[in-house]
């Protein structure tokens, strides 16, 4: 799976979309998880409604929401009041039994609020975007991770 980068501004909302084949994943619940380290597990943040037929209902866990358009085949995750610590690698998943199929790998980048003059030294993102592929609502911008780019910040 390629990694898609979504950029949002600190303090604002970021909307992440994960398209999928609606028939292939028919009847399957979806989840949004955070990758813990490059080889680590993906820790569940939020999942869609227990009843697949009600997957369109928005479910929240803290400041993260998930909703699934099961006919159109688009999973949407909203990160409200984006913070620097939200930056990192995530996955959209399709669940079936013990299995979790990756629908999309997502790198969330948090940009400093241009109206906020506080020190932005703690904000991290892997590099300037050479090209922006898709503009999304709620100030989100996505692009595919460029070859050679590292999805995790270097560890000291």
């Amino acid at each position: 799976h390629n990694t898609t980068v979504f950029q949002g501004v600190a303090g604002q909302s970021l909307q992440v979309s994960c398209p999928y084949d609606s028939m292939k994943h028919w009847g399957r619940r979806k989840a949004w998880c955070r990758q813990l380290g490059e080889k680590g597990p993906c820790q569940r943040v939020v999942s869609t409604h227990n009843l697949w037929l009600l997957s369109f209902l928005r479910r929240w866990n803290g400041s993260t929401a998930i909703t699934d358009d099961t006919l159109g085949g688009t999973l949407t995750i909203t990160l409200r009041n984006l913070q620097p610590h939200d930056a990192g690698l995530y996955q959209c998943q399709s669940l079936h039994g013990s299995e979790a199929d990756t629908l999309r790998k997502v790198l969330v980048e948090v940009l400093a609020d241009p109206l906020d003059h506080r020190d932005a030294g703690d904000l991290w993102f892997p590099g300037e975007s050479e090209s922006f592929e898709d503009a999304h609502v709620e100030h989100s911008i996505s692009r595919s991770l460029l070859e050679g780019e590292i999805p995790f910040p270097p560890t000291s």
Epitope: M23, K24, W26, G27, L53, H96, G97
Partner: antibody, heavy 124, light 107 residues
Framework: EVQLVQSGAEVKKPGESLKISCKGS????????IGWVRQMPGKGLEWMGI????????RYSPSFQGQVTISADKSISTAYLQWSSLKASDTAMYYC?????????????????WGQGTTVTVSS | DIQMTQSPSSLSASVGDRVTITCRAS??????LNWYQQKPGKAPKLLIY???SLQSGVPSRFSGSGSGTDFTLTISSLQPEDFATYYC?????????FGGGTKVEIK
Amino acid sequence: EVQLVQSGAEVKKPGESLKISCKGSGYSFTSYWIGWVRQMPGKGLEWMGIIYPGDSDTRYSPSFQGQVTISADKSISTAYLQWSSLKASDTAMYYCARLGHYSGTVSSYGMDVWGQGTTVTVSS
Amino acid sequence: DIQMTQSPSSLSASVGDRVTITCRASQSISSYLNWYQQKPGKAPKLLIYAASSLQSGVPSRFSGSGSGTDFTLTISSLQPEDFATYYCQQEYAVPYTFGGGTKVEIK
């Protein structure tokens, strides 16, 4: 009518290659997973693997991984099971089956439509 | 792989009898359990999916129950056409393994 029609019986020698087919009709072939099941003479059912013809995503049982290849040609609504080098122990009835669509609390699909089966006999 | 153990492996019963077949998984599989019927020389037929949901067109005398590791297929009143072999199958983790089968014979 929704159906899966399999290719006819095969008699082969050990070491020969073989490709059997399963043609779907009466439904959107690219929208359902297709599975293959082996039944050796007088024995039970063994799950071999599944394929999603829409994008050819395939999952194998470890017991059959590397022994067979599952493929599909969505342009002609056909799934395939093939061997590059048959063994006498491959003698069995092979069924293809469609995984249904379920929308309840648990997405356990079940294999709701089955082919008539293809008998494969491998003997020197 | 998840092992599926069916019991009994065979049973003799009469028309009108209530028949119960059990299936045990080697680990919890929630409700990801299907039941099939197979008659000699024929392809299997799906009876029950998701542990307890009756497949369309299957007579209501067939019912399924259970979750976790223990499951049951019940035929409330055995009919002549029900003499066959029954298989359970887990769909919780690849490979989606089958049980060894239970042959229901005429007493």
